[in-house]
Amino acid sequence: LECYSCVQKADDGCSPHRMKTVKCGPGVDVCTEAVGAVETIHGQFSVAVRGCGSGIPGKNDRGLDLHGLLAFFQLQQCSEDRCNAKLNLTLRGLNPAGNESAYEPNGAECYSCVGLSREKCQGSMPPVVNCYNASGRVYKGCFDGNVTLTAANVTVSLPVRGCVQDETCTRDGVTGPGFTLSGSCCQGPRCNADLRNKTYFSPRIPPLVLLPPPTTAAPSTRAQNSSSTTSTAAPTTTTSIIKPTTAQASHTSPHEMDLEVIQEEGASLSGGAAGHGGTAGHGGAAGHQDRSNMEKYPGKGGAQIPAKGGS
């Protein structure tokens, strides 16, 4: 089996001209491509992998919401030579939730990493953005986390920072098959420089205070109200918005394709990678553009071009 091979971080790596073909090893009978897109109120980006895979042919398509950070995951596996270039890897340069200048800053200020490398998203290096409320949702918290995609024996990860709805979340995450968006939230100006070591203590729960040992022989005085506080992880809430779309049959011969429109064959997963039997619609990777249509996410408003190039 011969498959396309590439790894994309933000908008580089699976760009046009950079596509490679690889011969898969014995026993490998599927080509795979996976794309994970993340949208903040200030922009969006994607990570993607193409290569020789494992499992069964089929498609999976899932939308996720983590405190107002939207994620869209697509997985496509197929068993023909070089069949793994059907998903969209291009995003629109975000109309920031419409026209950002039309939004009133709400006073919150966060570091923003949208498609930035780990080197450019360290500490106070990334750009600072003013948060605003969108679609009736209040974005007053800051987020620091990562998006990770694993497919074709490759793991690609990028940092994510920006404005979110929650101000106290700790190590929260949403997942799809081989896809994770996780991190922590905080409150206060530019508080999301580094939340990797944030503990589960909430500001509303007094932490366990360890008193130093008594220095005199006097009887030790117990701290008032010293009920021991055990930090337990609050259950993470994962909203999975699954969008099965109608498959589009391809009537084009493999050697004569119109570069403007490439249609996708439909396939449903029978308990494979993620267990949801939807088929990926054309142009999913970018998700939607309008934050007011939350129930439509992920919609067809994203990039609708063949793997790169415009439609």
Epitope: P16, R92, P306, G310
Partner: antibody
């Protein structure tokens, strides 16, 4: 119909500057990687520079690195090439090209840049 | 000196089959990158002829075909016609140069 229309070429002295523009229409410009490719008179094609759909990833050929700057304005559907410190060997027809399915699938008609004293 | 090597010229008579070669190295074609072919008719801009080694954009006749093996690729034109007289260029990504590279071009002449 997809169209790419270059402008801004002309006659310039060595060491001078020019700014080329490429107006795009008929497709979603903000989704497309774009490139500049040039062709010296009677010679072959030479790739010059490459910019991602959002503008955050950029590549240059070694021959123009540090002198040329590619940029784009997605709100105006326009691609630019700022050319500084021009040399005689930069004389060429400059084509704006769209990145399609891993290839330059649409080309403009080209604009001629002549560097001479 | 182009990174991809093509013969400077090729010729054939109408109806004949002509093949144009394109030789690269381990940093481009040999690295697995796909090869594209462009046709440039006299006085016009280049046009995509073959992409992804052997695929044709819509509108390109099936007389044109591409193939790739190892560090080289080739373009075959069967049933040669006078309107095929043009310059033909191959292209691929190059890891060392971090950009797409072109062959030097092959001028195809249709005799008679």
């Amino acid at each position: 119909e997809v169209q790419l229309l270059e402008s801004g070429g002309g006659l310039v002295q060595p060491g001078g500057s020019l700014r080329l523009s490429c107006a795009a229409s008929g497709f979603t410009f903000s989704n497309a990687w774009m490139s500049w490719v040039r062709q010296a008179p009677g010679k072959g094609l030479e790739w010059v520079s490459y910019i991602s759909s959002s503008g955050s990833t950029i590549y240059y050929a070694d021959s123009v690195k540090g002198r040329f700057t590619i940029s784009r304005d997605n709100s105006k559907n326009t691609l630019y090439l700022q050319m500084n410190s021009l040399r005689a060997e930069d004389t060429a027809v400059y084509y704006c090209a769209r990145e399609g399915l891993w290839a330059f699938d649409k080309w403009g008609q080209g604009t001629l840049v002549t560097v001479t004293s | 000196q182009s990174v991809l090597t093509q013969p400077p010229s090729a010729s054939g008579t109408p109806g004949q089959r002509v093949t144009i070669s394109c030789t690269g190295s381990s940093s481009n074609i040999g690295a697995g990158y796909v090869v594209h072919w462009y046709q440039q008719l006299p006085g016009t801009a280049p046009k995509l002829l073959i992409y992804d080694n052997n695929k044709r954009p819509s509108g390109v006749p099936d007389r044109f075909s591409g193939s790739k093996s190892g560090t080289s690729a080739s373009l075959a034109i069967s049933g040669l016609r006078s309107e095929d007289e043009a310059d033909y260029y191959c292209a691929a990504w190059d890891d060392r140069l971090n950009g797409p590279v072109f062959g030097g071009g092959t001028k195809l002449t249709v005799l008679g």
